[in-house]
């Protein structure tokens, strides 16, 4: 059928809670493409009716909630004018056991559910929440061994739990909980995270960590104004340059004449052993030439991009 097959890593998922997977494969999905989801090589596409428990939401497949019988291989087919890609995603549903103290970690979990804290340092855990715009997420609560986390060493910052002066007692089973609202209905998301510790010096020195972007695409309408933050953590004594580039050129230089796209003023928040930096990029007016172009956030030797993409056509308007 002329489609290129791409096989994604297996995903281990928790039963009885929402789950979503976005069919993006830059730069394939950055142009004008159609995305259709299927289950187990079925010829019938996944429903697009938002009341359906499993439905396609733009480029996402959304489970509200995930159930035992949903395990299987799902395919999303990305069709462009001259191309076709079929992405295979193997989803395995398991019964969550976050409060079962006899389970010493869950070895088959995805990497984002296994995180490492550095002893004696200030560090953080991330609650990975990947859902389409139609899902509204409430505030995040954090738990360790099924008890809500309190104390001055712990600070919740957006999707992260900041842990100051990490100790050996901080290892173990964590969970982040959030209430997701979709079409007026509420669902609980509870992500278990197995947290191990190390004395090793993380990145072996001052290699900054880009929290966002994550080499992801952003849907944005033509002609609109867009501001995107680049969030970076780095050591206090770092001398790293942080900037936005396009075509390997500073955006302020690249758009020197029009000044249509500009880099913002860098700000930072100081924590005990690291700084959290934010530097934004502003698109005063998004133009066609911006789509599919990687806008790179650089921080020392680290880099990550965003790519603008046109929203999928809204057929309800016709």
């Amino acid at each position: 059928d002329g489609c290129n097959d791409i096989f994604m890593k297996n995903e281990m998922l928790s039963a009885s809670q929402p789950f979503a997977f976005n069919c993006t494969f830059p730069p394939i999905t950055s142009g004008e493409v159609s995305v259709t989801w299927y289950k187990n090589s079925s010829k019938i596409p996944v429903s697009k009716i938002i009341q359906s428990r499993i439905h396609q939401d733009e480029t996402w497949i959304l489970f509200l909630p995930m159930e035992w019988g949903d395990s299987g291989v799902y395919q999303c087919v990305i069709k462009g004018r001259d191309s076709c890609h079929r992405i295979h995603v193997n989803l395995t549903v398991f019964e969550k056991q976050w409060c079962d103290t006899s389970v010493k970690g869950l070895p088959n979990l995805s990497d984002e559910y296994k995180q490492i804290l550095h002893l004696g340092k200030d560090d953080s855990l991330t609650c990975h929440l990947h859902f389409p715009k139609s899902c509204i997420l409430g505030p995040i609560k954090w738990y360790k061994d099924c008890n809500e986390i309190t104390g001055e060493r712990f600070t919740v910052l957006e999707t992260r739990l900041l842990v100051s002066n990490v100790s050996a007692e901080d290892r173990g089973n964590y969970a982040c909980q959030v209430i997701l609202t979709h079409s007026g209905k509420q669902y609980e998301v509870l992500n278990g995270i197995t947290v191990s510790i190390t004395e090793r010096a993380g990145y072996g020195g001052s290699v900054p960590k880009i929290i966002y972007p994550k080499n992801n695409s952003i849907e944005v309408q033509l002609g609109t104004t867009l501001i995107v933050d680049c969030n970076i953590t780095d050591t206090k004594d770092n001398t790293n340059l942080r900037c936005w580039r396009v075509n390997n050129t500073l955006v302020d230089d690249y758009y020197n004449e029009s000044k249509r796209i500009r880099e913002g003023v860098e700000t930072h928040a100081s924590f005990r052993e690291y700084n959290l930096y934010t530097v934004n990029i502003t698109f005063l007016e998004v133009k066609m030439e911006d789509y599919g172009l990687p806008f790179m956030c650089h921080a020392g030797v680290s880099a990550a991009y965003i790519m603008l993409q046109l929203p999928a056509p809204d057929f309800r308007a016709y």
Partner: antibody, heavy 120, light 106 residues
């Protein structure tokens, strides 16, 4: 159950490059730290270096100019290359990883070791 | 570099003896790790985070210490305990092992 298996030639000529591969089952090398350690005959253990979940590498400064650790996530393998070898590099080479009781530095899982002899 | 010095380098003891192996670091370390190795075999994690016994390690073993001085103690030596024991630190790179203590039957 995490298992590690070293493979590579048992005999390397002086000045050549020693190449070993560690194949991992039961865990993903995109989590944790993946270490190389060697044991000289009749001597103690020497830490060579590691490759981390993110692909970051650390090398013992005494070997840094000659050592390279890399990985192939599609095969769930990580490798050791040691260049310009001499007889002093004759040793049993082990790959190992931690994570026991959520402690990455507790090297609980080891390969069986492979003896590499440097000789012409 | 943190130098790890184990004493004694070798030790002859009898079954039932109480044995103490010491590991001294040239600078402070946060935690100590101990490994047991028998001839022709890979090392085994024995004690981690200074005082925690790895799975399968008999309770006659114990670990203690802080700063620059750490000990591994066997309360009543058994035949299967005769082996070489190594200490290791991960506090400061390069991550160093002690030279080993060979425990032999008297």
């Amino acid at each position: 159950q995490v298992q590690l298996q070293e493979s590579g030639p048992g005999l390397v000529k002086p000045s050549q490059t020693l190449s070993l591969t560690c194949t991992v089952s039961g865990a993903s090398i995109t989590s944790g730290y993946w270490n190389w350690i060697r044991n000289h005959p009749g001597k103690g253990l020497e830490y060579i270096g590691y490759i981390s979940y993110s692909g970051y590498t650390y090398y013992n400064p005494s070997l840094k100019s000659r050592v390279t650790i890399s990985r192939d996530t599609s095969k769930n393998q990580f490798s050791l290359k040691l260049s310009s070898v001499t007889a002093a590099d004759t040793a049993v080479y082990y790959c190992a990883t931690g994570g026991y009781d959520y402690v990455e530095d507790a090297l609980y899982y080891w390969g069986q070791g492979t003896l590499v002899t440097v000789s012409s | 570099d943190i130098q790890m010095t184990q004493s004694p380098s070798s030790l002859s003891a009898s079954v039932g003896d109480r044995v103490t192996i010491t590991c001294r670091a040239s600078s402070n370390v946060r935690y100590m790790y101990w490994y047991q190795q028998k001839p022709g075999k890979a090392p085994k994690l024995w004690i981690y985070l200074t005082s925690n016994l790895a799975s399968g390690v008999p309770s006659r073993f114990s670990g203690s210490g802080s700063g620059t001085s750490y000990t591994l103690t066997i309360s009543s030596l058994q035949p299967e305990d005769f082996a070489t024991y190594y200490c290791q630190q991960f506090t400061t790179s390069p991550y160093t092992f002690g030279q080993g203590t060979k425990l032999e039957i008297k």
